[in-house]
């Protein structure tokens, strides 16, 4: 049975086997087409989600679809039901928490009272002044909190206590990519991890350990990517994996936060990378122990210079490394998180591509997660 499962796929009605390599090849080899059912699926970027959270204390903003303007949500008459609606609009199913925060002196958006209409937040028509003088600070999920704060600068062995959202994404029990837990059902990784194998069956996720072989595997229900854009072949290197059964969080299995829509990180901002990738460029061996390293944001202009990536780094990507080189993510770390710590840890980037490993002028290039929030929310909403 093990041999059969490894090399063949069973079609139904009539029952017969086809070679597993015919799964997800674009041809209907089973009469009912089930060989093309459980495959990596693409999902369009979709419409603008009409709510978002700002890095200013996670304050809620609502879109007026008529004018295309964004407004800050006033705390007046804001309820748990409205908080739940806002989070559902972003695709969350967990119980949110919210609080009032004072309107700051730098408040540049108009502040409006919020109401609900057909399960979407709306601005109250006759919205007067914000009497409470407070905005809504909203958290849809308790995320980005680990048991231990990393202290080391440079490259160091990591503990799952520091990075409980890190997962190993495996095909046929072999580590292929890293990934990050975003909520009980969803793992974030890179689309290029699935180029070779587009059938969902043999992909598994392993969570809850810093050692590669030592933790149980979790079945995957769906793998979703964005439609390929031939104009920008390296763009859209992002994928979401939906787990068959929701994770139960613990000390070693917890979600990382998504970035805020306005999370603009300036050059030299400290960031962290983790992974089980190769310890040397062009070979070496995969590390059995999770490794962590501190890096920093590298200016896109510098990254696109003639002695670097010569314009290949787009608006939807970011560069990180250390100016003198030597610290970088490498093969096998693809799909893992590039992380920033404000109050919570946020996944601001996904390990995507680069030339070599750790060169001074060619740092790692990462998918900029904030550029894909809308897509993530639309995928989640479609799957709620």
């Amino acid at each position: 049975k093990v041999i059969l499962d490894k090399y063949y796929f069973l079609c139904g009605q009539p029952l017969h086997f086809i070679p597993r390599k015919q799964l997800c090849d674009g041809e209907l080899d089973c009469p009912l087409g089930e060989d093309e059912e459980h495959c990596v699926k693409s999902f369009p970027e979709g419409p603008a989600v009409a709510v978002r959270l700002s890095k200013d204390r996670s304050t809620l903003q609502v879109l007026d679809s008529a004018t295309g303007n964004w407004f800050s949500a006033c705390f007046d008459n804001f309820t748990e039901a409205l908080a739940e609606t806002a989070c559902r609009q972003m695709g969350y199913s967990s119980k949110p928490t919210f609080r009032a925060v004072e309107i700051g002196p730098d408040q540049d958006l108009d502040v409006v009272e919020i109401t609900e209409n057909s399960q979407e937040l709306r601005m109250r028509n006759s919205s007067g002044p914000c009497l409470s003088g407070s905005l809504v600070s909203l958290h849809c999920l308790a995320c980005g909190k680990s048991l231990k704060t990393p202290r080391v600068v440079g490259v160091e062995e990591a503990s799952v206590d520091s990075w409980p959202w890190q997962v190993s994404i495996q095909y046929d029990k072999q580590h292929v990519c890293g990934g990050s837990i975003l909520d009980p059902h969803w793992v974030l990784t890179a689309a290029h991890c699935f180029r070779k194998h587009t059938d969902v069956f043999n992909w598994k996720v392993r969570a809850g350990s810093d050692k590669l072989g030592s933790f149980p595997s979790l079945a995957v229900a769906k793998i979703i990517i964005i439609e390929f854009n031939p104009m920008y072949p390296k763009d859209n290197d992002i994928a979401l994996m939906k787990l068959q059964f929701p994770l139960t969080f613990s000390g070693t299995v917890r979600p990382i936060c998504l970035p805020f829509f306005d999370e603009e990180l300036t050059p030299a901002t400290p960031l962290w990378i983790i992974g089980w990738g190769f310890t040397k460029q062009n070979g070496g061996k995969m590390s059995d122990i999770l490794l962590q390293a501190s890096v920093q944001v590298i200016d896109s202009t510098r990254c696109n210079a003639d002695d670097a990536y010569q314009g290949e780094v787009t608006e939807k990507m970011m560069c990180a490394g250390i100016p003198e080189g030597g610290v970088d993510t490498c093969q096998g770390d693809s799909g893992g998180p590039l992380m920033y710590q404000s109050d919570q840890w946020h996944v601001v980037g996904i390990v995507s591509w680069g030339y070599g490993c750790g060169g001074p002028s060619t740092p790692g290039v990462y998918t900029k997660v904030s550029a894909y929030l809308n897509w993530i929310y639309n995928v989640w909403k479609a799957e709620l």
Epitope: K145, G208, T248, S250, G251
Partner: antibody, heavy 119, light 107 residues
Framework: QVQLVQSGAEVKKPGSSVKVSCKAS????????ISWVRQAPGQGLEWMGI????????RYSPSFQGRVTITADESTSTAYMELSSLRSEDTAVYYC????????????WGQGTLVTVSS | EIVMTQSPATLSVSPGERATLSCRAS??????LAWYQQKPGQAPRLLIY???TRATGIPARFSGSGSGTEFTLTISSLQSEDFAVYYC?????????FGQGTKVEIK
Amino acid sequence: QVQLVQSGAEVKKPGSSVKVSCKASGYTFRGSGISWVRQAPGQGLEWMGIIYPADSETRYSPSFQGRVTITADESTSTAYMELSSLRSEDTAVYYCARESSSWDYFDYWGQGTLVTVSS
Amino acid sequence: EIVMTQSPATLSVSPGERATLSCRASQSVRSYLAWYQQKPGQAPRLLIYGASTRATGIPARFSGSGSGTEFTLTISSLQSEDFAVYYCQQHGSLPLTFGQGTKVEIK
């Protein structure tokens, strides 16, 4: 509603061990960590350790490492704290407390169990 | 481990007055700070977590502020049921640690 019900008061001799239980109800037991916190008479609160029933992972305070063992039985939704090599200064009320939502603060507490260590 | 220090040890306040309790961490705990209230013979009760978020069912007269190493719990107008001992707890990293407590008593 969430409830944590602890076992009754204990009197123990120095050098012996005590095992206190904490039965949880009103929520999914494996979904939250259970910590143990103690309070000596007239003193403040002291965290001893935590168990995550989802994977039975435990973490202990260095002050109690080697002397405390926290376990959980998912079938009965019960957590246990065993403290060994008891001395008179372990006389305290021992509380179990539920960790809330992966953020390590305690939203529900047991009623407390008084452990008296006396020869 | 992170040491939490509360001040004052005792605060004497008249009913209806404002009470301000302080808590200092020996190193940054970001916003991972909780406040608990404990009355004699009872288990502690969660008031505030994440430095400023009120727990379910906690009256609006309780508010928390601060981040990093300096935190404050404010009770805007003390009611008779608020006279108790208040503890801060950092929930930023293990081992979790508590302050030694501030007793709020009737003046």
